[in-house]
């Protein structure tokens, strides 16, 4: 993979009810903030559905982030592990739309990826994802 | 293709690098079907803290 062009989003999409970011421009170096949700539909993504048979579900909830976790200081590291993840999407072509967070293409891909991770990791202490970047493969 | 890079946050002690990668790889097929995203070349690494938004130009695995 090569190429320097990229787009990025420095927000934390997390598994609790979304709220407006309270960070200031001075805290730019820490990418974790709490964005408003990508959809007009108000939602809490903490609820988890597990199928027990073809006609029933039961529900459990992962507690949302607490306000102490929202700190933009290095204290955020207390009790939190971070992992950097990268992967290729081979059936998509990179284009200039993925350098511009205001484009539909960028927002749709970011929304799909965010939703996918919120679902994959919702059972295991997952707090959220941030700093999504796209670049050519 | 498009390379996607992002940072995941977990409660400390709940998961390790290997499990993050294993769980993600487990749902690659579903991702292809649900979101029309064909995912390959997955790489996961620990992020030392503190870190900056600009610190992810490289990673190891």
């Amino acid at each position: 993979a090569s190429g320097s062009a990229s787009g990025s989003a420095s927000t934390l999409v997390h598994n609790g009810t979304s709220a407006r970011a309270t960070t200031t421009p001075a805290s730019k170096s820490t990418p974790f903030s709490i964005p408003s949700h990508h959809s007009d539909t108000p939602t809490t993504l903490a609820s988890h559905s597990t199928k027990t048979d073809a006609s029933s579900t039961h529900h459990s909830s992962v507690p949302p982030l607490t306000s102490s976790n929202h700190s933009t200081s290095p204290q955020l590291s207390t009790g939190v592990s971070f992992f950097f993840l990268s992967f290729h999407i081979s059936n998509l072509q990179f284009n200039s739309s993925l350098e511009d967070p205001s484009t539909d293409y960028y927002q749709e891909l970011q929304r799909d990826i965010s939703e996918m991770f919120l679902q994959i990791y919702k059972q295991g202490g997952f707090l959220g994802l941030s700093n999504i970047k796209f670049r050519p493969g | 293709s498009v390379v996607v890079q992002l940072t995941l946050a977990f409660r400390e002690g709940t998961i390790n690098v290997h499990d993050v990668e294993t769980q993600f790889n487990q749902y690659k097929t579903e991702a292809a079907s649900r979101y029309n995203l064909t995912i390959s070349d997955v790489s996961v690494s620990d992020v030392p803290f503190p870190f900056s938004a600009q610190s992810h130009h490289h990673h190891h695995h």
Epitope: H37, H38, S39, D40, T41, T43, T44, L45, S47, S49, T50, K51, A54, S55, T57, H59, R111, D112, E115, M116, Q119, I120, Q123 | Q26, Y27, T29, E30, A32, S33, R34, Y35, N36
Partner: antibody, heavy 122, light 106 residues
Framework: EVQLVQSGAEVKKPGASVKVSCKAS????????INWVRQAPGQRLEYMGW????????KFNEKFKGRVTITVDTSASTAYMELSSLRSEDTAVYYC???????????????WGQGTTVTVSS | DIQLTQSPSSLSASVGDRVTITCSAS?????IHWFQQKPGTSPKLWIY???NLASGVPPRFSGSGSGTSFTLTVSSLQPEDFATYYC?????????FGGGTKVEIK
């Protein structure tokens, strides 16, 4: 008891639009995906797209992109599928069906609406 | 799109017969689902993830297969089993369905 109840039959002229509703009950509406599938007379089932009421996110089969709109009203636990620029080959029974997010995605579409017959004729 | 081909497209059988329906995929898939549909009604999930019976489906039904070849088997056909059966893949977007196999009374 889980139920998906769809709106009644529609007769439309070519070029018109149709909006079919699907009201869910018996489960938490925002926990599950709603899919739309259609079946033309004597034909196989054809997948149209999905919406996740928990986020409003949706995705369409490329065949219908630009002609189909899928929305939800979470307060009414109802999903909607609107198909525009109708042509005679859109005559079909339209179904909504629910399924599951990861990691339960492999359970499939376990509950279906009763179907809405849409007839396109001049 | 992945094409699913079912065979036979129809079959006539008697109560008590053992019946096997096949579903062949144009590319390898992880698993398939099977649906049962009777005239004038909506499809019902019958077998999910290749081999798991949906709620209320009698144990005379079974599913198996992998890759590009999958089967639905009824060990001893009963009167209520006469219907059309569809396979579906969701390993690739968009999900696709087979053309159906109509099981009729001989």
């Amino acid at each position: 008891e889980v139920q998906l109840v769809q709106s009644g039959a529609e007769v439309k002229k070519p070029g018109a639009s149709v909006k079919v509703s699907c009201k869910a009950s018996g489960y938490t509406f925002t926990d599950n995906y709603i899919n739309w599938v259609r079946q033309a007379p004597g034909q196989r089932l054809e997948y149209m797209g999905w919406i996740y009421p928990g986020s409003g996110n949706n995705k369409f089969n490329e065949k219908f992109k630009g002609r189909v709109t899928i929305t939800v009203d979470t307060s009414a636990s109802t999903a909607y599928m609107e198909l525009s620029s109708l042509r005679s080959e859109d005559t079909a029974v339209y179904y909504c069906a629910r399924d599951y997010p990861f990691p339960s995605y492999h359970y499939g579409m376990d509950y279906w609406g009763q179907g809405t017959t849409v007839t396109v004729s001049s | 799109d992945i094409q699913l081909t079912q065979s036979p497209s129809s079959l006539s059988a008697s109560v008590g017969d053992r019946v096997t329906i096949t579903c062949s995929a144009s590319s390898s898939v992880s698993y398939i689902h099977w649906f049962q549909q009777k005239p004038g009604t909506s499809p019902k999930l019958w077998i999910y993830s290749t081999s798991n019976l949906a709620s209320g489906v009698p144990p005379r039904f079974s599913g198996s297969g992998s890759g590009t070849s999958f089967t639905l088997t009824v060990s001893s056909l009963q009167p209520e089993d006469f219907a059309t059966y569809y396979c579906q893949q969701r390993s690739s977007y968009p999900p696709t369905f087979g053309g159906g196999t109509k099981v009729e009374i001989k």
